[in-house]
């Protein structure tokens, strides 16, 4: 058995994911995880699922974070700006935003980086998953530390 | 005793701490912190170690920040961005890097101000020590509460 | 009773809040937040008050932070940067500044979105508020998820 | 591509001391992890001590902790291996070794000969009794 999952009794196990991005060819704005390099899945009760949510089976209360790391140029890039959403599905529910920050493009040649930070508490209901869409993944950075997403349980 | 070690009981005491930054003359690229201004530090199981690495006594799941602010200037600056790493050095093993964000210098004269934060849950043995290292420390801003490092175990 | 409240015993309760921001004609420089939208108030032992400040009824260890997305423009502001600061007030104590970001302003036209993040751990008394503060509420984004404040007690 | 050249063996008599040191040339050393193995005739080369690229931290080998000191000096771009009350069975050539500290894997150990990149050519410590 886990031994985060021990730490706080059987009633009431550590529940925490740090999970590392991946680069992806598919044409979603839905970014990809890996459970790869430095991550943490504590145990069963929170899972990454097909590279791009993490899913809970506990109600309660998360603090859950993304970072975003993105190279972009002002003329190379739509007039809006770089957008990261931290974004809630809920079993029978719609799909809803829970957090977004916007960066506007860097004029720096030929992209100029930022980093973006999200987090926040918000209450979770068994089975439901998290994740982050960004307006351009191709933009995204993907070095060493750079882009990550997480959750632990309160 | 401290307050907060009593809190959750003698076998599972709080663990947390927020140092804040210090200027510091030294040729290196680890920032420097000091127990001041409105800082935490727990009790024993976690230290500040020669100013600069937070050590912690307890295997575990760690939620660790660094919050960074520095002015820095296109012309300036090398044409690498300003980048700050969050980074672990554990017993017997190589420092590595757990969190990274980067900002494209601004051309704001004669420096421009911007704020990185990094934030992320880690595991950490026994002994482990987790740092902040940028590109160029000369830039970073050492005013009330722009520039913050600390953890809090799960 | 609130589940939240139950989960860790009644000794022990889960303290939580995440409230999300308020478009205010007020001439003020502190943010105003509303229990609106996907908000988090975990019991009554933290409560928004006055829509601007967050009161804790309970001393302890606390993960304080704060998400603010401004959209400003170089030549129509001022020269200095656009600062948010998280701030402190306790019960017979002078307010005080816990954390504080700073961000240059865009030269992009009208102008141009940026996020920033701040968090940290500090102990707070019994009856302590905390609150945010920024150099130009006029420039703050209210849309959904930009703008939002909260906290956890350990 | 780092040189690393060592100096400082020679002949001591056991309860004496030497200071070992590796000047390294080339690209700029701040980003290496540094460390110094041994390899006494007919045995194996092993882990001595090394020293954290950022931090300046230390790892040693359990038995050698008490009598040898690893410190680097950056700004010569040098690394120091301090060795006190040696004893016959220290004698060995001593070697020098880097280590680039950036993309390194969860499981790697700085005692692991394997995860060094650059080596020098050594230095030979003669301990007589």
């Known amino acids: 058995e886990n031994s985060f999952e021990m730490q706080k009794g059987d009633q009431n196990p550590q529940i925490a994911a740090h999970v590392i991005s991946e680069a992806s060819s598919k044409t979603t704005s839905v970014l990809q995880w890996a459970e790869k390099g430095y991550y943490t899945m504590s145990n069963n009760l929170v899972t990454l699922e097909n590279g791009k949510q993490l899913t809970v089976k506990r109600q309660g209360l998360y603090y859950i974070y993304a970072q975003v790391t993105f190279c972009s140029n002002r003329e190379a890039s739509s007039q809006a700006p770089f957008i990261a959403s931290l974004c809630l599905k809920s079993p029978g529910r719609f799909e809803r935003i829970l957090l977004r920050a916007a960066n506007t493009h860097s004029s720096a040649k030929p992209c100029g980086q930022q980093s973006i930070h999200l987090g926040g508490v918000f209450e979770l209901q068994p089975g439901a998953s998290v994740f982050v869409n960004v307006t351009d993944p191709s933009q995204v950075s993907h070095g060493t530390g750079f882009t990550s997403f997480g959750l632990l349980k309160l | 005793e401290n307050s907060f070690e009593m809190q959750k009981g003698d076998q599972n005491p709080q663990i947390a701490a927020h140092v804040i930054s210090e200027a510091s003359s030294k040729t290196t690229s680890v920032l420097q912190w000091a127990e001041k201004g409105y800082y935490t530090m727990s009790n024993n199981l976690v230290t500040l170690e020669n100013g600069k690495q937070l050590t912690v006594k307890r295997q575990g799941l760690y939620y660790i920040y660094a919050q960074v602010t520095f002015c820095s200037n296109r012309e300036a600056s090398s044409q690498a961005p300003f980048i700050a790493s969050l980074c672990l050095k554990s017993p017997g093993r190589f420092e590595r890097i757990l969190l990274r964000a980067a900002n494209t210098h601004s051309s704001a004269k004669p420096c421009g101000q911007q704020s990185i934060h990094l934030g992320g849950v880690f595991e950490l043995q026994p002994g482990a020590s987790v740092f902040v290292n940028v590109t160029d420390p000369s830039q970073v801003s050492h005013g009330t509460g722009f520039t913050s490092f600390g953890l809090l175990k799960l | 009773e609130n589940s939240f409240e139950m989960q860790k015993g009644d000794q022990n309760p889960q303290i939580a809040a995440h409230v999300i921001s308020e478009a205010s004609s007020k001439t003020t420089s502190v943010l105003q937040w509303a229990e609106k939208g996907y908000y988090t108030m975990s019991n009554n032992l933290v409560t928004l008050e006055n829509g601007k400040q967050l009161t804790v009824k309970r001393q302890g260890l606390y993960y304080i932070y704060a998400q603010v997305t401004f959209c400003s423009n170089r030549e129509a502001s001022s020269q200095a940067p656009f600062i948010a600061s998280l701030c402190l007030k306790s019960p017979g104590r002078f307010e005080r500044i816990l954390l504080r970001a700073a961000n240059t302003h865009s030269s992009a036209k009208p102008c141009g979105q940026q996020s920033i993040h701040l968090g940290g751990v500090f102990e707070l008394q019994p009856g302590a508020s905390v609150f945010v503060n920024v150099t130009d509420p006029s420039q703050v984004s209210h849309g959904t998820g930009f703008t939002s404040f909260g906290l956890l007690k350990l | 591509e780092v040189q690393l050249v060592e100096s400082g063996g020679g002949l001591v008599q056991a309860g004496g001391s030497l200071r070992l040191s590796c000047a390294a040339s080339g690209r700029t050393p701040l980003n290496y992890h540094m460390a110094w193995f041994r390899q006494a005739p007919g045995k194996e080369r092993e882990f001595v001590a090394a020293?954290?690229?950022?931090?300046?931290?230390?790892d040693y080998s359990d038995s050698l902790k008490d009598r040898f000191t690893i410190s680097r000096d950056n700004a010569k771009a040098t690394l120091y291996l301090r060795m006190n009350n040696l004893k016959p069975e220290d004698t060995a050539v001593y070697y020098c070794a880097a280590r680039e500290t950036t993309h390194i894997s969860t499981s790697d150990r700085v005692n692991e000969m394997r995860h060094y990149d650059y080596w020098g050519q050594g230095t030979l410590v003669t301990v007589s009794s």
């Open positions: 020293i954290s690229s950022l931090l300046g931290s230390t």
